[in-house]
């Protein structure tokens, strides 16, 4: 298809040829093209391209362009050739190639497809059935990410209330750019009756740590010492903790934000791998104090998506006073 636009026409530069589009993995869309026929010999060819909504303009010498995009709607790329990297230079006539999502009734596609990466060890995706689907639909979830050679099928399909879901192992690879990439997801049915739904989950978002595990509570003077086990797989600069202390007598609950802290006081079991400690000041030892802890990722490591871990199991210390 030619976009015959007077503003983008130049006399010297012919359009690119053989523009084609293909899909790799689940959501990697790749456009390739050949140089224009009869391009000026003194022209160092560069290619101008942008998507249909004039977004993501790019000028580059390569004869290909790719994008990772959930194929839930039609996407088009327009490409032209020019003799410099100057954005103000008018490229040749722009050639356009589009790719449409798989066929199917849009009302049959699953909705609210979302995934959470639990403790950097497994990903759990969930979705709601589309409006035009039969209640006995058997769903299949496929996933792909950079460290997989091929697309995998998720085996652990489950149902929780109205939601369907599936979970699969996804372990953080140490010392790599693993987390700078994404997981590509597709959900369809075994019978091929529903329109497939796609999602792309960046590995820097939707991360939910496991809850901490409280190991020990002890008093020293009027201070309460709390020791807990950190969730595995995270580095210390990427987590912080919320320690909640409820006092039965005063009916107050105090909340403290805590950095992962070394267990240096003699009151703590020292040098225990992967544990943190915190001293809560001014706690009444002769009353019942109940402690619970949850953990959240730091926005400098993972995108802010408001995902706290579940609360730890509560642990109590002190005596509940008899009401007189």
């Amino acid at each position: 298809d030619y976009k015959d636009d007077d503003e983008s026409r130049t006399e010297t530069q012919p359009p690119v040829t053989n523009l084609s589009v293909s899909v790799e993995n689940l959501c990697t869309v790749i456009w390739t093209w050949n140089p224009p026929e009869g391009a000026s010999s003194n022209c160092s060819l560069w290619y101008f391209s942008h998507f249909g909504d004039k977004q993501d303009k790019k000028i580059a010498p390569e004869t290909r362009r790719s994008i990772e995009v959930p194929l839930n709607e039609r996407i088009c790329l327009q490409v032209g050739s020019q003799c410099s990297t100057n954005e103000s230079e008018k490229p040749s006539i722009l050639v356009e190639k589009c790719i449409s999502p798989p066929e199917g009734d849009p009302e049959s596609a699953v909705t609210e497809l979302q995934c959470i990466w639990h403790n950097l060890s497994y990903m759990k995706c969930s979705w709601l059935p589309g409006r035009n689907t039969s209640p006995d639909t058997n769903y299949t979830l496929y996933y792909w990410h950079r460290s997989l050679e091929k697309i995998h099928q998720c085996e652990n399909i489950f149902r929780e209330g109205q939601y369907f879901g599936c979970s699969f192992d996804l372990t953080k690879v140490k010392d790599s750019s693993f987390e700078q990439h994404s997981v590509q997801i597709m959900v369809k049915d075994n019978a091929g009756k529903i329109k497939p739904s796609f999602n792309i989950v960046p590995l820097t978002s939707r991360v939910k740590p496991d809850p901490p595990h409280i190991k020990n509570l002890s008093f020293h003077n009027d201070d309460l010492y709390v020791q807990w086990e950190n969730p595995q797989n995270f580095i210390s600069r990427c987590l912080f903790y919320e320690v909640e202390v409820n006092n039965s007598q005063t009916e107050t609950h105090n909340v403290f934000y805590v950095q992962e802290a070394k267990c240096e006081n003699p009151e703590f079991e020292r040098n225990v791998e992967n544990t943190s400690c915190f001293m809560v000041p001014g706690v009444l030892p002769d009353t019942l104090n109940t402690v619970r802890i949850r953990v959240k990722t730091n926005k400098l490591c993972y995108e802010d998506d408001k995902l706290w871990s579940n609360w730890s199991q509560e642990m109590s210390i002190g005596k509940k006073r008899n009401s007189t």
Epitope: I235, R237, F240, Q259, E260, K299, L300
Partner: antibody, heavy 118, light 104 residues
């Protein structure tokens, strides 16, 4: 007591290089991020970037990426902010601050005034 | 990129009055990450509130923070003479432009 002590005021010419410092004490220097904040004369606060001295991991605000370099020497509990070629527009007060994982700046240095003028 | 907009730009009040400062985020943010600072002329800023509502160590209880999502508030219940200053809200790499609380 947590303290961050910054190096003294500097007067420089455009094109010169500069490295200012921020020494932490009274806490585990390697366990907290250090952030740098710029305040131009009569203006508000601007977040420049952070470093985690434990592993020297840095993050820059897009406006300051490539303009400054943040580094740290954990053996002497000191963080640095440096310029390879100063401009008149770099004239400002620069603060370092301790930056816990929840993102507030809970302890601040006294500030280093940098004046760049020909 | 999240933008924090503070209002009003300047608040003219008398000692003993209540001050209400607003900070609005351009998109919903986690309240865990919202902080408030006070800055007096010639001094470094001082942390008042973190996690939207938790008072920092040594901050008097006349200062309180509230809010969630996109709307956050710093309240000074009764202004003391030493409270006249500039107040900033912050979320990680973004600061609001500041609200000046001045004596009427």
């Amino acid at each position: 007591e947590v303290q961050l002590v910054q190096s003294g005021a500097e007067v420089k010419k455009p094109g010169e290089s500069l490295k200012i410092s921020c020494k932490g004490s009274g806490y585990s220097f390697t366990s907290y991020w250090i952030g740098w904040v710029r305040q131009m004369p009569g203006k508000g606060l601007e977040w420049m970037g952070v470093i985690y001295p434990g592993d020297s991991y840095t993050r820059y605000s897009p406006s300051f990426q490539g303009q400054v370099t943040i580094s740290a020497d954990k053996s002497i509990s000191t963080a640095y902010l440096q310029w390879s070629s100063l401009k008149a527009s770099d004239t400002a007060m620069y603060y370092c601050a301790r930056f816990p994982n929840w993102g507030s700046l809970d302890h601040w240095g006294q500030g280093t005034l940098v004046t760049v003028s020909s | 990129e999240i933008v924090l907009t503070q209002s009003p730009g300047t608040l003219s009040l008398s000692p003993g009055e209540r001050a209400t400062l607003s900070c609005r985020a351009s998109q919903s943010i986690s309240s865990s990450y919202l902080a408030w600072y006070q800055q007096k002329p010639g001094q470094a800023p001082r942390l008042l509130i973190y996690g939207a509502s938790s008072r920092a160590t040594g901050i008097p209880d006349r200062f309180s923070g509230s809010g969630s999502g996109t709307d956050f508030t710093l309240t000074i219940s009764r202004l003391e003479p030493e409270d006249f200053a500039v107040y900033y809200c912050q979320q990680y790499e973004t600061f609001g432009q500041g609200t000046k609380v001045e004596i009427k």
